[in-house]
Structure formats: C-alpha cells, structure tokens
C-alpha cells in the first residue's frame, strides 16, 4: 500500500472547503476537503439528507 | 484534458481597460480558486489577484488594487481579468492559473500590449 | 503581503555544476514554497512544490530544501538544458514570487 504524505492546507486555502477539514495531499500537489457528515462534494458545498423510507403497506 | 484557454492578444491605448477571458474545459472552476499571474516583457513572475469562483470573493495585490477587478461566470466556466486605466508598463502577457484541486495548472498566456 | 527575496539574480555555471538559489520569506512561510523553471516564450513549469516533492516527471537533480523564512533550490549537475529563469513562489498566504534567477552556461 503506497503511503500518501498529507499535512494541512496553508492559509491561503482558507475557506475552502465549506463544509469540512482542508488537507494537503503533498505526493498528489492537490488540496483535499474531508467532509462534515450530511456533506458532499469536492468542496463539501453540497448537502444531502438521507431519507429513511416508512414501510410500504404492501411489505406489511 | 484539462485546459485553460485565454483570449487573444490585444493592443490598447493608455487610458483604456482591458478584459481576458480564461475559459476552462475538463473540470469545473467551481471547484478552484483562479488565479492571475502576469509578466512584463523580459521581467519577473507578478501575482495580480484571484477568484473562489464558488463563493464569488476575490483577494487582490495591494498594488491592484481599485485597478483590478477579477470575476467569473460558472454557467460559462469562464474567468475573466479586467485592468483599466491601462499604461505602458501594464504591457505583459497575463496567464491565469487553477489551484486548489490541483497545484497550478497554467493557462497559455494573453499579450496585452498598451501602446499611443 | 508576504516579500521573496530570491537570489543570486543571475548566474553563470559550468556543465556538471553544483547550482544554489536561495528565496527568504519576509516571514514563516511553513514550507508552503514552490520552485518554477520558465524557458523564453514559454509559460513557467511547475518543478517542485512543498519545499522539496519533486513533480512527476521531474529530473532528480532538482531538489529543494528549506523551513521557516529560508529556502534552496538546488541543480545537482548543471545540464545544457537547464538554461532557463527559476522563480520561486510562496503560497502561504497569497502568493508572491520570488524575482527571479537567469542561469546561464559558462
């Protein structure tokens, strides 16, 4: 398994991950935005909640 | 493939503004922040400015600043730089620059020459 | 803003040769540096990025050091093809470039 070096984004990526924690994937030269629950998206912009569908009638 | 493509040369008179668009392909600018570098002819590396084309905020170099101003449009996957109260020494070649899901991938560059 | 003060301006090497550039920060730039090579009419290319990881495709005669305010970028062994101007950019906060360093062959 390749070992990926990460370490925080500098200042300058400040407010760039809206929704979650910025990291530097160093090997990779690309800033990586690690979601908050209930996020999505390259910049966690996106929020999605996860319905929990009743019983049909049918199935019961 | 990613790209990013400028607009083509232009020549202005002192006094005039100038607008270059940089149009992005292969990925989405909202998932960057576009940057704007530019250089003077036989000169050094000069950063302008740039745009978080998500949230719509821009940060400027002090010496640009009111001179300067950066947009873009996410329906387009377009940038644009636009410097008004042009003078000789704005004559460079402007590259914009994608950061943020990737370390600086360079557009080709625009010459925007300011000549009477 | 962050100032880059990079030096030598210009140098002039021999083939084989070790070559030194050196960029200070005017403060702690936490390593956040990157080191570009730009050859004449073309655009600059990216060669190394936080402080020292070499990108793909990078010669391994190019490294980079450094932390806190002071930062080298190092030729191992000068080739022919190495002519070009290297630029230095911190991006820590903002970005500044560094004002550049002519090397030529001797």
């Known amino acids: 398994v390749a070992q990926v070096s990460i370490t925080k984004c500098s200042s300058d990526m400040n407010g760039y991950c809206l929704h979650g924690q910025c990291i530097y994937l160093v090997d990779m030269s690309q800033n990586y935005c690690r979601c908050e629950v209930g996020y999505t998206g390259v910049r966690c912009e996106h929020f999605f909640l996860t319905v929990h569908q009743p019983l049909s009638k049918e199935y019961v | 493939q990613d790209q990013l493509v400028q607009s083509g040369a232009e020549v202005k008179k002192p006094g005039a503004s100038v607008k270059v668009s940089c149009k992005a392909s292969?990925?989405?600018?909202?998932?960057?922040?576009i940057q704007w570098v530019r250089q003077a002819p036989g000169q050094g590396l000069e950063w302008m400015g740039r745009?978080?084309?998500?949230?719509?905020?821009?940060k400027y170099r002090e010496k640009f600043e009111g001179r300067v101003t950066i947009t873009a449009d996410t329906s387009t996957n377009t940038a644009y730089m636009e410097l008004s109260s042009l003078r000789s020494e704005d004559t460079a070649v402007y590259y914009c620059?994608?950061?943020?899901?990737?370390?600086?991938?360079w557009g080709q560059g625009t010459l925007v020459t300011v000549s009477s | 803003d962050i100032q880059m003060t990079q030096s030598p301006s210009s140098l002039s090497a021999s083939v084989g040769d070790r070559v030194t550039i050196t960029c200070k920060a005017s403060q702690d730039i936490h390593k956040y540096i990157a080191w570009y090579q730009q050859k004449p009419g073309q655009a600059p290319r990216l060669l190394i990025q936080?402080?020292?990881t070499l990108q793909p495709g990078v010669p391994s005669r190019f490294s980079g050091s450094g932390s806190g305010t002071d930062y080298t970028f190092t030729i191992s062994s000068l080739q022919p093809e190495d002519i070009a101007t290297y630029y230095c950019?911190?991006?820590?906060?903002?970005?500044?470039f560094g004002g550049g360093t002519k090397v030529e062959i001797k």
């Open positions: 936080y402080t020292s």
């Open positions: 292969g990925f989405n600018i909202k998932d960057t922040r």
């Open positions: 620059v994608r950061s943020g899901t990737l370390f600086d991938f």
């Open positions: 745009i978080d084309p998500l949230r719509g905020n821009t």
């Open positions: 950019l911190q991006y820590d906060n903002l970005r500044t």
